[in-house]
Interface confidence: medium
């Protein structure tokens, strides 16, 4: 069974998938469609790297531009370095500026909804 066929079988169960499962899926050539990606738990999507999302979505990564203002894509963008987002070639904006440090202050993030940044 190839990655796409496997994805079809598990698609209906993915809504509650944890980050670890999504990372594993990204290595299996599944080409997750955007409708499914948009239904994933935000907290599961946030830790994914740009490279992992690109591998997870396959051709559908090109559709991220259309969803950049919607969760979980919007929140995921806020967590990525702008340099990394730029490598997607989709014009996604809102990432962490170059030279900033990201502090994983979970309480601060829970209150504000955004990561804490320290300037250069």
């Amino acid at each position: 069974m190839n990655g796409s066929e496997y994805f079809v079988k598990i698609q209906s169960f993915l809504g509650g998938a944890p980050t670890e499962d999504l990372k594993a899926l990204s290595q299996q050539n599944v080409s997750m469609d955007l409708a499914t990606f948009m239904k994933l738990r935000t907290d599961a999507v946030l830790p994914l790297t740009v490279a992992e999302v690109q591998k997870l979505l396959g051709p559908h990564v090109e559709g991220l531009k259309a969803e950049e203002r919607h969760r979980p894509v919007r929140d995921w963008i806020l967590r990525q370095r702008q340099d990394d987002l730029d490598t997607l070639g989709l014009g996604l904006q809102g990432g962490i500026p170059n030279g900033y440090l990201v502090l994983d202050l979970s309480m601060q993030e829970a209150l504000s909804g955004t990561p804490c940044l320290l300037g250069p």
């Epitope: 990655g3 796409s4 066929e5 079809v8 050539n29 080409s31 469609d33 409708a35 396959g58 051709p59 559908h60 090109e62 559709g63 531009k65 259309a66 730029d86 490598t87 997607l88 070639g89 989709l90 014009g91």
Partner: antibody
Framework: EVQLVQSGAEVKKPGASVKVSCKAS????????MHWVRQAPGQGLEWMGN????????NYNEKFKNRVTITVDKSASTAYMELSSLRSEDTAVYYC?????????????WGQGTLVTVSS | DIVMTQSPDSLAVSLGERATINCKAS??????IAWYQQKPGQSPKALIY???YRYSGVPDRFSGSGSGTDFTLTISSLQAEDVAVYYC?????????FGGGTKVEIK
């Protein structure tokens, strides 16, 4: 208005290479991936590959993987498709087409096509 | 690779009558399908995306339906300018693939 202007027709000998250009205007070139599709005379459409204009990353159809190279010149908003080791069956019209422009998937815009004739 | 099989290869329909083109994917592609119209000597023109959504400017006599593996393009009332070859295409996974085309003519 989105416009894709391709280079002119080419006649090549078997074993030679051809490089077709596609100049884009009317949209942010680096925000959308550029794809190449070919069509042999009287035949259907065949996807060759695409390129991420931001970093030059590409995906290729395995059928062409060792013979095709898709590149971009960001400063000129131009994409290129080079096909090497030409044979008679490569005689076709070659099209460039960006995907997902305006948030809708699919190839909404196409270049005018470049006829490449391979003949001894 | 996902194989897209179109049927019929050609279709002759009277003006004002309905034309129906089928496209079958070799595996589930959700609704990640587009339809194109190509007239002789021209570049393809996009008609439908996501299986059932018309691109702006496409007449409402064109409609698409289906999901999974079976898809249909319907021209509800054929006009003379609809004579062309129609292609389906999946963008669910690489490599992107097209159907072989269906030639629509006037009976």
């Amino acid at each position: 208005e989105v416009q894709l202007v391709q280079s002119g027709a080419e006649v090549k000998k078997p074993g030679a290479s051809v490089k077709v250009s596609c100049k884009a205007s009317g949209y942010t070139f680096t925000s959308y991936w550029m794809h190449w599709v070919r069509q042999a005379p009287g035949q259907g459409l065949e996807w060759m590959g695409n390129v991420n204009p931001s970093n030059g990353g590409s995906n290729y159809n395995e059928k062409f993987k060792n013979r095709v190279t898709i590149t971009v010149d960001k400063s000129a908003s131009t994409a290129y498709m080079e096909l090497s080791s030409l044979r008679s069956e490569d005689t076709a019209v070659y099209y460039c087409a960006p995907h997902y422009i305006g948030s809708r998937p699919g190839f909404a815009y196409w270049g005018q096509g470049t006829l490449v004739t391979v003949s001894s | 690779d996902i194989v897209m099989t179109q049927s019929p290869d050609s279709l002759a329909v009277s003006l004002g009558e309905r034309a129906t083109i089928n496209c079958k994917a070799s595996q589930n592609v959700g609704t990640n399908i587009a339809w194109y119209q190509q007239k002789p000597g021209q570049s393809p023109k996009a008609l439908i995306y996501s299986a059932s959504y018309r691109y702006s400017g496409v007449p409402d006599r064109f409609s698409g339906s289906g999901s999974g593996t079976d898809f249909t393009l319907t021209i509800s009332s054929l006009q003379a300018e609809d004579v062309a070859v129609y292609y389906c295409q999946q963008y669910n996974s690489y490599p992107l693939t097209f159907g072989g085309g269906t030639k629509v003519e006037i009976k």
